[in-house]
């Protein structure tokens, strides 16, 4: 297993609709054809997997149908979008990239993107 540098923004504020997008960029040492991207969430020292996708270079990322993540790839960049976020989902979202094929296998883990999520203000009751 060889190490690889992964860069991602330090801080992102999700939209009022609970959507956060950020780029995860990896320094590919060779010409990988199969890449696996995993998003991990770290909060209060606990790490959980948010979503994962394996893709062939030049193809779209395919997450599971019920995944809260979508993404596109361009060269050594993956543009990740996480939706359905609420304030309780605020935390550090870490991008993990694995170059699966051809060998050698490379692994890179970013420092994480702190995603702040603000629940929208409830609309005041209106009299009709």
């Amino acid at each position: 297993c060889k190490a690889m540098h992964v860069a991602q923004p330090a801080v992102v504020l999700a939209s009022s609709r609970g959507i956060a997008s950020f780029v995860c960029e990896y320094a590919s040492p060779g010409k990988a054809t199969e890449v696996r991207v995993t998003v991990l969430r770290q909060a209060d020292s606990q790490v959980t997997e948010v979503c994962a996708a394996t893709y062939m270079m030049g193809n779209e990322l395919t997450f599971l149908d019920d995944s809260i993540c979508t993404g596109t790839s361009s060269g050594n960049q993956v543009n990740l979008t996480i939706q359905g976020l609420r304030a309780m989902d605020t935390g550090l979202y870490i991008c993990k990239v694995e170059l699966m094929y051809p060998p050698p296998y490379y692994l890179g883990i970013g420092n994480g993107t702190q995603i702040y999520v603000i629940d929208p203000e409830p609309c005041p009751d209106s009299d009709f």
Epitope: A10, V11, L13, Y116
Partner: antibody, heavy 117, light 108 residues
Framework: QVQLVQSGAEVKKPGASVKVSCKAS????????ISWVRQAPGQGLEWMGW????????NYAQKLQGRVTMTTDTSTNTAYMELRSLRSDDTAVYYC??????????WGQGTLVTVSS | EIVLTQSPGTLSLSPGERATLSCRAS???????LAWYQQKPGQAPRLLIY???SRATGIPDRFSGSGSGTDFTLTISRLEPEDFAVYYC?????????FGQGTKVEIK
């Protein structure tokens, strides 16, 4: 080193607007956020809101909603805070501060805004 | 809105003594999102502690933070002359982010 440099002191009349700038250097501007905090004379710190320089999304304190606008110019690594319809109780030192993953540092030197007729 | 209440309002101590400052939250705050700042007259605040217990770069180890839930503490083990200032806690885990009203540490 990482530094935030703010614009100079301003004197404004009630009802006017003020726009304070905060120029960042020494780091990748779009990777972080900028928060604005004010401090009235002899008082404590009041959080005004913040902007994500990565995507321009903002989160404002409810009491200032509708009067405050925070923006960034990523070409010059500068953040701006505009406050409209100024009142005498808006007289304060206004600070910008970098928002990191779970820390706020460094702070700008502060900009004194005086609202007086 | 999470209200942070700092106590005492003023702490009168001598150099070399231990200072214990309290910050109590009206609702539970994730310890990842609690910070302490020091402010001297005419200066901008300076980050001391973030994540409730992590010391910021360049902060001497006489400053330490602890606590979880609704009760947090900043401890200065041995007060140096330059430590006399106002100290603020801040939570940034729940919007709106809020500050405590401050504790002034003054020379006795």
């Amino acid at each position: 080193q990482v530094q935030l440099v703010q614009s100079g002191a301003e004197v404004k009349k009630p009802g006017a607007s003020v726009k304070v700038s905060c120029k960042a250097s020494g780091y990748t501007f779009t990777s972080y956020g900028i928060s604005w905090v004010r401090q009235a004379p002899g008082q404590g710190l009041e959080w005004m809101g913040w902007i994500s320089a990565y995507n321009g999304n903002t989160n404002y304190a409810q009491k200032l909603q509708g009067r405050v606008t925070m923006t960034t110019d990523t070409s010059t690594n500068t953040a701006y805070m505009e406050l409209r319809s100024l009142r005498s109780d808006d007289t304060a030192v206004y600070y910008c501060v970098r928002v990191g993953a779970n820390w706020f540092d460094p702070w700008g030197q502060g900009t004194l805004v005086t609202v007086s007729s | 809105e999470i209200v942070l209440t700092q106590s005492p309002g003023t702490l009168s101590l001598s150099p070399g003594e231990r200072a214990t400052l309290s910050c109590r939250a009206s609702q539970s705050v994730s310890s990842s999102y609690l910070a302490w700042y020091q402010q001297k007259p005419g200066q901008a605040p300076r980050l001391l502690i973030y994540g409730a217990s992590s010391r910021a770069t360049g902060i001497p180890d006489r400053f330490s933070g602890s606590g979880s839930g609704t009760d947090f503490t900043l401890t200065i083990s041995r007060l140096e002359p330059e430590d006399f200032a106002v100290y603020y806690c801040q939570q940034y885990g729940s919007s709106p982010w809020t500050f405590g009203q401050g504790t002034k540490v003054e020379i006795k």
